[in-house]
């Protein structure tokens, strides 16, 4: 991929674009401020979703981790004619149908929507739309809202998890690329690491989860360290201590040698889950090593 | 495991109204995400969606019988009601409850209502 | 809200493959599920979310979405797979319903 920062959290991404007649002549730069952020997510275990919204709302690519695909969606991405109305909601309902597929399946994977929008939504329509994005929330989503040139920021601030969560981008399409790290920084979240990554059997153990983006939750009260064990069993322990960068977590007291725990981060008190690559392992520890 | 069931069926005179419940259990409208639909299915014909109510309390109705219906949820009792005003003998259906948001997973076994003076 | 034109009647042998359409304008992107009702029953879900398959219901059945058709696909069909079939998508808060297909195992 290019080159600069990167995300390497494995969760469900949806990009939720407006194609309303406003945007007809900047359908360019919004579709390459998509490839550019869709491009720095690299987890294999991250997928993703294009979701285009005018007078309605249509998944132009669904929900997958298949990197071809991908590539294949983002060439229909270009392909969009702008054209109708912004009926935002349409959009938020698209994502919030997927999310809740995939919950059903019991996959219970963690949901990061970043909505675009120019324009300001009339009051039903933005009635809607706040609806809708507290119907992908109550799924466990965490959304966040890039507007740009007429915009209403106090809109998006209620559409989106919070100001914190809202982009504005007031210098007109073309600076949308100037924004591309921001969101990313924001957007992320990911697990890098665990110290120590080898833990003795049978033993009581406290483990630092490296990564990034640690405090985006809502509510930093609700964040989880998941255990995966072997598998099969999932062990949620509350964490010691929250900061960006890293948590602070009771380990799970794993009996046996060999035994493998996978990471994961759940945002919202277990409702889903941040999957990464990173395993603790336990080995046999002699006394006094 | 999850089960519902309508009220006994009816005989309605038209310009009456229709008051249906249904009764569920095996899982919890407290829980976000899912919600309870009403379906009605005349003699022979097609399946037509009524209603449905989200576990938030949101409501969406069926644009062509909006006016005539409205949903409600008592989720202590594990029931949701559905009344429908104004009954033509074109109502006349079976009407199922169903569990789900954007499907329907489980389903009541239905229940006969016929408008006839 | 979408339209969604399934044929009234499709037949096949049994140990054939049935293929059971469902058009609408770029249904491709948005969902679809199947049902299956027979005579005298609730309907019972046989596919979501375009492919998925509930447990429970055999393998026989799939689904696929694309362009302006859905397909819900019986191979091997059986004569208890005889019954009539309903497509259904979610569109702007609502749930819609096809028309049904009667399927025949000859």
């Known amino acids: 991929e290019d080159g600069g920062p990167a995300c390497y959290g494995g969760f469900d991404l949806y990009f939720i674009l407006d194609k309303s007649g406003s945007v007809l002549h900047h359908w360019n730069e919004i579709y390459y401020f998509v490839e550019q952020l869709a491009h720095k997510f690299i987890s294999p275990q991250l997928r993703m979703s294009f979701i285009v919204f005018s007078t309605r709302g249509t998944t132009l690519m669904k929900l997958t981790e298949d990197r071809e695909q991908i590539r294949q969606g983002l060439e229909e991405l270009q392909k969009v004619l702008p054209g109708g109305d912004t009926y935002m909601h349409e959009g938020f309902e698209r994502a919030s149908e997927q999310i809740y597929y995939e919950n059903r399946q019991g996959y219970r994977t963690a949901s990061v929507i970043i909505a675009l929008t120019d324009g300001e939504l009339h009051e039903d329509l933005f009635f809607y739309s706040e609806r809708e994005a507290n119907r992908s929330r109550d799924l466990g989503a965490i959304v966040y809202c890039v507007g740009v040139k007429d915009f209403n920021e106090t809109q998006l601030a209620r559409i989106a998890d919070s100001k914190d969560h809202v982009f504005p981008v007031n210098d007109g399409f073309q600076a949308l690329q100037g924004i591309i790290h921001s969101i990313l920084k924001k957007s992320c979240i990911e697990i890098l690491a665990a110290e120590p990554s080898t833990i003795c059997a049978g033993e009581s153990f406290q483990v630092v989860v490296r990564g990034n983006g640690f405090r985006h939750a809502r509510n930093v009260d609700r964040v989880l360290c998941s255990f995966k064990i072997n598998d099969s069993v999932t062990l949620n322990e509350k964490p010691f201590s929250v900061e960006d960068t890293y948590l602070l977590c009771p380990a799970p007291i794993l009996k046996e040698v060999g035994m493998k725990a996978a990471l994961q981060v759940s945002m919202n008190d277990g409702l889903s889950f941040i999957s990464s690559s990173v395993i603790i392992t336990t080995t046999h520890c002699s006394d006094g090593s | 495991q999850v089960q519902l069931k309508e009220s006994p069926g009816a005989l309605v005179k038209p310009t009456q109204t229709l008051t249906l419940t249904c009764t569920f259990s095996?899982?919890?409208?407290?829980?976000?995400?899912?919600?309870v639909s009403w379906i009605r299915q005349p003699p022979g014909k097609a399946l037509e969606w009524l209603a449905h109510i989200y576990s938030n309390d949101d409501k969406s109705y069926s644009t062509s019988l909006k006016t005539r219906l409205t949903i409600s949820k008592d989720t202590s009792k594990n029931q949701v009601v559905l009344t429908m005003t104004n009954m033509d003998p074109v109502d006349t259906a079976t009407y199922y409850c169903?569990?789900?948001?954007?499907?329907?997973?489980?389903w009541g076994q239905g229940t006969l209502v016929t408008v006839s003076s | 809200d979408i339209e969604l034109t399934q044929p009234p009647s499709v037949s096949v042998a049994p140990g054939q493959t049935a293929r059971i359409s469902c058009s609408g304008d770029n249904i491709g992107g948005i969902y679809v599920h199947w049902y299956q009702q027979k005579p005298g029953q609730a309907p019972v879900l046989v596919i979501y979310?375009?492919?998925k398959r509930p447990s429970g219901i055999p393998e026989r059945f799939s689904g696929s979405n694309s362009g302006n058709t859905a397909t819900l696909t019986i191979s091997g069909t059986q004569a208890e797979d005889e019954a009539d079939y309903y497509c259904q998508s979610y569109d702007i808060t609502s749930l819609v319903f096809g028309g049904g297909t009667k399927l025949t195992v000859l």
């Open positions: 979310a375009d492919s």
């Open positions: 169903a569990r789900g948001g954007y499907f329907l997973d489980y």
């Open positions: 095996g899982f919890s409208l407290s829980t976000s995400g899912g919600g």
